[in-house]
């Protein structure tokens, strides 16, 4: 389970590397961060490393209510402040690693840790 | 109503330290970003730098950074800028400014503080 | 770091006058622009957020607009107490946070 982590946490971290370049990993971390109510990897300061976004900017993903821009020049009360690795892996380890078996090539660095059937799945539960 | 009340300014040495401290009240002093800003006799606003709401996030000025340290005290609502290694150039009034952020601009200003360096 | 540039730098108008003072953008800000007034010796007081929107408080003769990289602050009739300088001030990408260079309104 902690290799399962330590590879959820450096492919996300990896994921928001790619974030303002590909508009795919854009829209899947951002299902993610608003879905599971978190921003960043361990939290949302994170997002201030990423070098090519804006250091007083999150994704919009990352508001409490979002709307276009809610992300630019943000305020922490606005903002979800908790990491998604924890709170994803948390929901992992509770929802699926308990029901699946996970190969190691599924945790390849390219490779979705986390399927799209089982985000619509947090979602609707 | 809401004040910002600045402290700490005075005259000192090149080199000399200072801490500024500013008293919040009136307001919710965690819901807001905080800045210092200065203005040097007859010249325009420099922001200095600010700090996030919780502390977690602190960027300064080129002109002041490995020099000077903000930070807060949410307990007390009080904000603080640590001076060290002044020069003859950080001379100037400072000012506690909070920030609402987002697209809100900086809407309350303290009176300021002086800081006079010469030697 | 976005540079933000005003114009004029100092201004000679009279009571009853309508002013308008620039503000550019070295780069797109959208409409995260912020205008504030400061007299002498006193703090500097915000007056317009949002390039448009107006401060509670704020006489309606100030109004400001533009998106992007060109703004202004208009003062539709001015009245004695508008003497003083304003700032442009950007808050779309920071640190720094990035004023204007002041323009000084003077009585003609």
């Known amino acids: 389970r902690d290799k399962v982590m330590s590879e959820f946490n450096n492919n996300f971290r990896q994921q928001m590397e790619n974030y303002p370049k590909n508009n795919h990993t854009a829209s899947i971390l951002d299902r993610m961060q608003a879905d599971f109510k978190c921003c960043g990897a361990a939290n949302y300061t994170d997002w201030e490393k990423i070098p090519s976004m804006s250091k007083n900017r999150v994704p919009d993903s990352c508001c409490i209510n979002v709307t276009v821009g809610c992300g630019i020049n943000f305020n922490e009360k606005a903002i979800h402040k908790e990491g998604c690795v924890e709170k994803i892996g948390g929901w992992l380890r509770k929802n699926v690693l308990e029901q699946k078996l996970i190969s190691e090539e599924d945790l390849g660095g390219e490779q979705k840790l986390i399927s799209e059937e089982d985000l619509h799945h947090h979602h609707h539960h | 109503q809401v004040q910002l009340v600045e402290s700490g300014g005075g005259l000192v040495k090149p080199g000399g330290s200072l801490r500024l401290s500013c008293a919040t009240s009136g307001f919710t002093f965690t819901d807001y970003f905080m800045n210092w800003i200065r203005q040097a006799p007859g010249k325009g606003l420099e922001w200095v730098s600010y700090i996030s709401n919780s502390g977690s996030i602190r960027y300064y000025a080129d002109s002041v950074r490995g020099r000077f340290s903000i930070s807060r005290d949410n307990a007390k609502n009080s904000l603080y800028l640590q001076m060290s290694s002044l020069r003859a150039d950080d001379t100037a009034v400072y000012y506690c400014v909070r920030d609402p952020r987002q697209i809100y601009g900086m809407d309350v200003w303290g009176q300021g503080t002086t800081v006079t360096v010469s030697s | 770091d976005i540079q933000m540039t005003q114009s004029p730098s100092s201004l000679s108008a009279s009571v009853g006058d309508r002013v308008t003072i620039t503000c550019r953008a070295s780069q797109s800000i959208s409409s995260y622009l912020n205008w504030y007034q400061q007299k002498p010796g006193k703090a500097p007081k915000l007056l317009i957020y949002a390039a448009s929107s107006l401060q509670s408080g704020v006489p309606s003769r100030f109004s400001g607009s533009g998106s992007g990289t060109d703004f202004t602050l208009t003062i539709s009739s001015l009245q004695p107490e508008d003497f003083a300088t304003y700032y442009c001030?950007?808050?779309?990408?920071?640190?720094?946070?990035?004023f204007g260079q002041g323009t000084r309104l003077e009585i003609k």
């Open positions: 001030q950007q808050s779309y990408s920071t640190p720094p946070i990035t």
